[in-house]
């Protein structure tokens, strides 16, 4: 008999839904130069509201008016463009709402220029056709706010063109970004107009601005990076998986178990078995067989595939997942029907992905 047995209750405590640390994109408010703009902070029960622009505290001045939950910008200029945030401070917590302001006129070579990155290969512009820098693929720049788990890699892009070909430099919080400003430095791929930081840490939080310039002009674009520290928790299994299945004798079936875990999870597929006609040992614990587990020799441990099933394969299949914090398990039943009976639920073969990191 296997040395492993399930002793804890298989019911899962309700937990917060799994997060992949994605933050919805901020709303964008567009204004033409000279226009006035009014934005309301969309946070409830805000006792005290503070405002920032590109991570820097925003106070009232002759063009910026802050009244309660409203921000007013009078006579907007392109310099007012950026990532704004209002933070509501309450007695027990605080909450931040982000939004973008884009002050641009119709002929500006700004963020809303059409994506022109359709050519198979880059073609140099005519040397006589002088042109100030412009964005070539604004689609790759739409996501301004990046909330990333610690230890992940982050890439910011500013694909641009111009003649002569512009140069690109990067600022962090408005100052020159130097390699020594972060452990491990960073990578810049000029041909891809990208900045890459590996293994991000909380001190990498801030605003990153690409400045693209040639002798005919300069454009810039700011990204905001938030580094989310991972909160260890036991594995979370997606509700409803694995799902009950039925198939005929000789058929194939798959059980899928979707796992959310920051810490490396170990996945096991277990089935109750009988030994000498008994389902339980002398100690009262059930006889269990580990059918599959994650490891070097096991690909796609989230999926248990059974081929050419027999009636003996019917029964309960348990997906048990553990990490160093704890464990979780959920089960499903397989019904094996005689050949002449059609199954209630047809087999679905999907290439299910592995556990979420």
């Amino acid at each position: 008999r296997p040395s492993f047995s399930l002793v804890e209750d298989t019911t899962l405590e309700p937990e917060e839904p799994p997060t992949k640390y994605q933050i919805s994109q901020p709303e964008v408010y567009v204004a033409a130069p000279g226009e006035s703009l009014e934005v309301r902070c969309l946070l409830k029960d805000a006792a005290v509201i503070s405002w920032t622009k590109d991570g820097v505290h925003l106070g009232p001045n002759n063009r910026t008016v802050l009244i309660g939950e409203y921000l007013q910008i009078k006579g907007a200029t392109p310099r007012d463009s950026g990532l704004y945030a209002c933070t509501a401070s309450r007695t027990v917590d605080s909450e931040t709402w982000y939004f973008m302001v884009n002050v641009t006129d119709a002929i500006s070579s700004g963020d809303d220029e059409d994506d022109t990155d359709g050519a198979e290969d880059f073609v140099s512009e005519n040397s006589n056709n002088k042109r100030a820098p412009y964005w070539t693929n604004t689609e790759k720049m739409e996501k301004r706010l990046h909330a990333v788990p610690a230890a992940n890699t982050v890439k910011f892009r500013c694909p641009a063109g111009g003649n002569p070909m512009p140069t690109m430099r990067w600022l962090k919080n408005g100052k020159e970004f130097k390699q020594e400003h972060r452990i491990g430095g960073y990578k810049v791929r000029n041909q891809h107009w990208s900045l890459i930081m590996e293994s991000v840490v909380p001190s990498d939080k801030g605003n990153y601005t690409c400045v693209v310039e040639n002798e005919y002009g300069s454009i810039n674009h700011t990204y905001h990076l938030d580094v989310v520290e991972r909160s260890p928790h036991r594995p979370i299994l997606q509700a409803g998986l694995p799902a009950n299945a039925s198939t005929v004798v000789g058929g194939d079936v798959e059980f899928v178990c979707k796992v959310y875990s920051d810490a490396q999870p170990h996945i096991q597929w277990i089935k109750h078995v009988e030994k000498n006609g008994s389902k339980y040992g002398p100690d009262g614990l059930p006889y269990l067989k580990v059918l599959k587990h994650s490891g070097i020799n096991s690909s796609n441990a989230e999926v248990l595939a059974l081929f050419n099933v027999t009636e003996a394969d019917a029964g309960e299949y348990i997906c048990k997942v553990s990490n160093y914090i704890g464990q979780a398990n959920q089960s499903a039943w397989l019904t094996v029907l005689p050949k002449q009976q059609a199954p209630g639920r047809e087999k679905e073969i999907t290439a299910s992905p592995d556990y979420l990191e």
Epitope: V148, N152, V188, R189, Q191, H192
Partner: antibody, heavy 119, light 107 residues
Framework: QVQLLESGGGLVQPGGSLRLSCAAS????????MSWVRQAPGKGLEWVSV????????HYADSVKGRFTISRDNSKNTLYLQMNSLRAEDTAVYYC????????????WGQGTLVTVSS | DIQMTQSPSSLSASVGDRVTITCRAS??????LNWYQQKPGKAPKLLIY???NLQSGVPSRFSGSGSGTDFTLTISSLQPEDFAVYYC?????????FGQGTKVEIK
């Protein structure tokens, strides 16, 4: 048309060195980043190293860092991979590949050259 | 480094079948994912770049989708010449890691 032709492979003893070359033609070599990708017998693809068109940027897979050096001579339209301190696990077919503009997708590949590290 | 996990590792299919291969990244890689086809003794061939763009000269039965961590390569109607090994590759991080490959065999 675009052509990439690798050379320099062969049998070498563990600890030895080898220099691979990749002759490029049919495109403006200096406009493109180039990579080396290898494939051990019966195994999958493993990216090895990349170099930007002007040589200003290079990067290596952890498995070869400190032992392999990528370089290019744009006047000769040639990419190089200097491999030192070779190990048995470096045995593979080595491909040179061109990166698409604005994307690190390898749109053209050479036919590959076999490197065998064995005593 | 970012890990790329392909599934299934192999599959058997018939000519005319719709085939789906998935690739999962260990972190968000935006749309920085490419798909390649490789036949025995040959160099790989680029099929799809940046998750969903069909490379010039590749038949339209090949398509790619996905962003973030989960990506899919679909062959809408498998042809005899499509039996090969398929690889995904991320280019979000400086080390352009490949998936372990999916072998598409004749049923």
């Amino acid at each position: 048309q675009v052509q990439l032709l690798e050379s320099g492979g062969g049998l070498v003893q563990p600890g030895g060195s080898l220099r691979l070359s990749c002759a490029a033609s049919g495109f403006t070599f200096s406009d493109y980043a180039m990579s080396w990708v290898r494939q051990a017998p019966g195994k999958g693809l493993e990216w090895v190293s990349v170099i930007e068109g002007d040589g200003s940027y290079t990067h290596y897979a952890d498995s070869v860092k400190g032992r392999f050096t990528i370089s290019r001579d744009n006047s000769k339209n040639t990419l190089y991979l200097q491999m030192n301190s070779l190990r048995a696990e470096d045995t593979a077919v080595y491909y040179c590949a061109r990166e698409k503009t604005y994307s690190s997708a390898f749109d053209y590949w050479g036919q590959g050259t076999l490197v065998t590290v064995s005593s | 480094d970012i890990q790329m996990t392909q599934s299934p590792s192999s599959l058997s299919a018939s000519v005319g079948d719709r085939v789906t291969i998935t690739c999962r990244a260990s972190q968000d890689i935006s749309s920085d994912l490419n798909w390649y086809q490789q036949k025995p003794g040959k160099a790989p061939k680029l099929l799809i770049y940046d998750a969903s763009n069909l490379q010039s000269g590749v038949p339209s039965r090949f398509s790619g989708s996905g962003s973030g961590t989960d990506f899919t390569l679909t062959i809408s109607s498998l042809q005899p010449e499509d039996f090969a090994v398929y690889y995904c590759q991320q280019h979000y991080s400086p080390s352009h890691t490949f998936g372990q490959g999916t072998k598409v065999e004749i049923k």
